[in-house]
């Protein structure tokens, strides 16, 4: 049994998340995850799910009763989702921590928008000239 | 030239994001995107970046001076990042809109945690027995 299971059960007790009424009105994450089979689609969704859990854990980080459980689960997420790659985790954390109401952050984000957009589709990974031809092709052919 | 370029330039004017000082203290997104070449890693990062821009655009949605620009860019993101797939966009939006301070949402999230964790690594897509063997191997080799 993976280490997170026992700790997740502990969190369930703490949050009364084992009660039958918790399942009312559908799931938060599970139905969405079932919709997406392609690895890249799953990563888009899991990225949001993981950032949700990190925020949730942050809100309860000072509660001694669940501190060990939270730390074990975070460590397991780091192994499973970030492949124990600290740089990947650090980059992810940076992105989740930017404040959308900070005017300097807003200006930077808008400044970078054109380059971010240019890289959004998988086609963006090939060389510039080839890409522009391909995307014209996409615009004209898909 | 892709249609978003002109509209992004308009946003730059609006936010004074063309000023030389905007580049001070490094980039928000571009350096991070340069770090990740694997498609699934890129999707993890782009998922956070796209949700940032959507939040930013939401904050300025009633400003007539940039409304057309924002709508064009959002449409372009939907074509490029979500492949014009509204179901993908809808699932993404649901995930970004959950409130981490809502106690019902918290309980649901903790209730689903074990199953979410079980699916976090790409190995999770193969059969259960095979996965447990493979994951022992992964944990020992990473």
């Amino acid at each position: 049994q993976d280490p997170y299971v026992k700790e997740a059960e502990n969190l369930k007790k703490y949050f009364n998340a084992g009660d039958p009424d918790v399942a009312d009105n559908g799931t938060l994450f599970l139905d969405i995850l079932r919709n997406w089979k392609e690895e890249s689609d799953r990563k888009i969704m899991q990225s949001q799910i993981v950032s949700f859990y990190f925020k949730l854990f942050k809100n309860f980080k000072d509660d001694q009763r669940i501190q060990k459980s939270v730390e074990t689960i975070k460590e397991d997420i780091n192994v499973k989702f970030f492949n124990s790659n600290k740089k990947k985790r650090d980059d992810f954390e940076k992105l989740t921590n930017y404040s959308v109401t900070d005017s300097n952050v807003q200006r930077k984000a808008v400044h970078e928008l054109i380059q971010v957009m240019a890289e959004l589709s998988p086609a963006a990974k090939i060389g510039k000239r080839k890409r522009s031809q391909m995307f014209r092709g996409r615009r004209a052919s898909q | 030239q892709d249609p978003y370029v002109k509209e992004a330039e308009n946003l730059k004017k609006y936010f004074n994001a063309g000023d030389p000082d905007v580049a001070d203290n490094g980039t928000l997104f571009l350096d991070i995107l340069r770090n990740w070449k694997e498609e699934s890693d890129r999707k993890i990062m782009q998922s956070q970046i796209v949700s940032f821009y959507f939040k930013l655009f939401k904050n300025f949605k009633d400003d007539q001076r940039i409304q057309k620009s924002v709508e064009t860019i959002k449409e372009d993101i939907n074509v490029k990042f979500f492949n014009s797939n509204k179901k993908k966009r809808d699932d993404f939006e649901k995930l970004t809109n959950y409130s981490v301070t809502d106690s019902n949402v918290q309980r649901k999230a903790v209730h689903e945690l074990i199953q979410v964790m079980a699916e976090l690594s790409p190995a999770a897509k193969i059969g259960k027995r095979k996965r447990s063997q493979m994951f022992r191997g992964r944990r020992a080799s990473q």
């Epitope: 089979k37 615009r139 004209a140 | 709508e71 014009s84």
Partner: antibody
Framework: EVQLVESGGGLVKPGDSLTVSCVAS????????IHWVRQAPGKGLEWVAT????????FYSDSLRGRFTVSRDNANNSVYLHMSSLRGEDTALYYC?????????????????WGRGTLVTVSS | NFMLTQPLSVSGYPGKTIVISCVRS????????VQWFQQRPGSAPAMVIY?????PSGIPDRFSGSVDASSNSASLTISGLKTEDEADYFC??????????FGGGTKLTVL
Amino acid sequence: EVQLVESGGGLVKPGDSLTVSCVASGFTFSNYFIHWVRQAPGKGLEWVATISGRTKYMFYSDSLRGRFTVSRDNANNSVYLHMSSLRGEDTALYYCVRGYDHSDSNSAADLLHWGRGTLVTVSS
Amino acid sequence: NFMLTQPLSVSGYPGKTIVISCVRSSGSVASHYVQWFQQRPGSAPAMVIYEDSHRPSGIPDRFSGSVDASSNSASLTISGLKTEDEADYFCQSYYGNNQVLFGGGTKLTVL
């Protein structure tokens, strides 16, 4: 009230070209994708092409790519389908259909509003 | 090669319930929305279900839509069948980037 009105159909010879038009009203035209869907006499529905709203990206059915070109004029609430090298099997009723507003996460349904169609007959 | 396969014809008596299936040949049915259209002779298609299970305004609750990932199919159910329901029904979904896909259509006969 949302309305889509197609025009420009008619009888043409094999190998000829033809452009059919669609004029829309009752909604913010530039926000919406527009589809062309055709139906041969007594047959099912076949998607032909789509053009996005403000970005004007074009998407085509694999079987028709190269012969058909979709375009739009947002200032005049109009969409066009230019068809070249026409064949007998292109004979059909061509429908103009409103798609999603992809800039709005609460967009009305895709393919909810249809025109009445314009008939294109390809025959020698 | 993506296909949506429907039965050619379905029939039922007034007041009864019929189900029209729409099987997706490849790709996951759950990864794209499914719509259903009713087409009466001489008329343009009219939507009866959008985004898997939602009804446009004016469509009675006798019409319902569902998606089953295990069979990779969508279904349109019409209960309390009426003579006016006699028509052709088409399912529709997507593949790739905005590629629209229609099923072959099902002729519903009310006996």
